[in-house]
């Protein structure tokens, strides 16, 4: 098959800061560009960014998390708590440009979502959110 | 429709599974006005880290 | 690593049907689209439709419609297009392309259909 | 639907020469444009997503770029597997649709 895989990594963002929290094999990815998209969990930004030709983001950065040894824990060894999210948009209709992070479709509706969880989660314990997978309902 | 699926980050400590749920739930229909999403079906659960790459895709409700 | 392996060759009659398969292998979970596009003899690339593997959405391109179906089996993780009214002009080799965070990212090794009285 | 005029349809370079392709949309269509690389006999390999990201493997002599509707792919110093046919591929609406393709020739 053509290509070739890369590793995935989940970039936290809230505020204009991001927390990187990177798996193996390391994503040449960055927090300031869309992921490879050889990645199966594209990194998504929970931030408001400015779109550019190249559509990159910009934010300032701060150090990778690093993972517990505790691989049960939800938690990182910085104290950081995941949660999994699942919901429908029963007024939106899915295609297949909500693949795609370079498309407008899937930027605007990132960016909603984003907005709207930097809304519901105002307080101070809320660092952002990643991995952002849209399918259809 | 379109299904949404993503991780949210706290600090440990900060929230549970419930409280993340119960917030959501709270802003669904503000939601609907200000951002014209019509929110339903919402499931939240405890990501273990390190999460796999593939952790959150077999949450298929 | 992924892959994604496509059935064997076909040699097909006009006003037949062909059925190809597009395999993924090298990842475990069944939540991404698979595009489907043509290549005829010494010619360019042509996008036929899209499925989401697992879910019963597709888009078609017009050209196509009402002469192509795409299905899919999310248990053994392969995705299926089937071409009807086979005509000389379908003959081509027919490619499938896997999403992974982007469009088109994998391709399939390709089905060569040849259409033939 | 949307068209992608891509030029020159062929051309004939040496190995180390700088070499660019153009493809040119009918309409706006962002940043959402594909470059596949594909050797006779072969499958399409993607060489560069979202107009200008390099894929994962993919050598840094290639780099996409873009200026209003017009889509530049540019190797830098051409080396001998290199020579193929080169597409775009835009994906800003369906139906999806590909340049007519460039051959790149050995000189």
């Known amino acids: 098959a053509s290509g070739s895989a890369s590793g995935s990594a989940s970039t936290l963002v809230h505020n204009g800061t991001s927390a990187r929290a990177t798996t193996t094999p390391a994503s040449k990815s960055t927090p300031f560009s869309i992921p490879s998209h050889h990645s199966d969990t594209p990194t998504t930004l929970a931030s408001h960014s400015t779109k550019t030709d190249a559509s990159s983001t910009h934010h300032s950065s701060v150090p990778p998390l690093t993972s517990s040894n505790h691989s049960t824990s939800p938690q990182l060894s910085t104290g950081v708590s995941f949660f999994f999210l699942s919901f429908h948009i029963s007024n939106l209709q899915f295609n297949s440009s909500l693949e795609d992070p370079s498309t407008d479709y899937y930027q605007e509706l990132q960016r909603d979502i984003s907005e709207m969880f930097l809304q519901i989660y105002k307080q101070g314990g809320f660092l952002g959110l990643s991995n952002i997978k849209f399918r259809p309902g | 429709s379109v299904v949404v699926q993503l991780t949210l980050a706290f600090r440990e400590g900060t929230i549970n599974v419930h409280d993340v749920e119960t917030q959501f739930n709270q802003y669904k229909t503000e939601a609907a006005s200000r951002y014209n999403l019509t929110i339903s079906d919402v499931s939240v659960s405890d990501v273990p880290f390190p999460f796999s790459a593939q952790s959150h895709h077999h949450h298929h409700h | 690593e992924v892959q994604l392996v496509q059935s064997g060759a076909e040699v097909k009659k006009p006003g037949a049907s062909v059925k190809v398969s597009c395999k993924a292998s090298?990842?475990?979970?069944?939540?991404?689209?698979i595009n489907w596009v043509r290549q005829r003899p010494g010619q360019g690339l042509e996008w036929i439709g899209y499925?989401?593997?697992?879910?019963?959405?597709?888009e078609y391109n017009e050209k196509f419609k009402g002469r192509v179906t795409l299905t899919s089996d999310t248990s053994a993780s392969t995705a299926y297009m089937e071409l009807s009214s086979l005509r000389s002009e379908d003959t081509a080799v027919y490619y499938c392309?896997?999403?992974?965070?982007?469009?088109?990212?994998?391709w399939g090794q390709g089905t060569l259909v040849t259409v033939s009285s | 639907d949307i068209q992608m005029t891509q030029s020159p349809s062929s051309l004939s370079a040496s190995v180390g020469d700088r070499v660019t392709i153009t493809c040119r949309a009918s309409?706006?269509?962002?940043?959402?444009l594909n470059w596949l690389q594909q050797k006779p006999g072969k499958a399409p390999k993607r060489l560069i997503y979202a107009t200008s990201s390099l894929d994962s493997g993919v050598p840094s002599r290639f780099s996409g770029s873009r200026s209003g509707t017009d889509y530049t792919l540019t190797i830098s110093s051409l080396q001998p597997e290199d020579f193929a046919t080169y597409y775009c591929l835009q994906y800003a609406s369906s139906p999806y649709t590909f340049g007519g393709g460039t051959k790149v020739e050995i000189k």
């Open positions: 499925i989401y593997l697992g879910s019963d959405y597709t």
């Open positions: 392309a896997r999403s992974a965070g982007s469009l088109f990212a994998y």
């Open positions: 309409q706006d269509i962002g940043i959402t």
């Open positions: 090298g990842y475990t979970f069944t939540s991404y689209g």
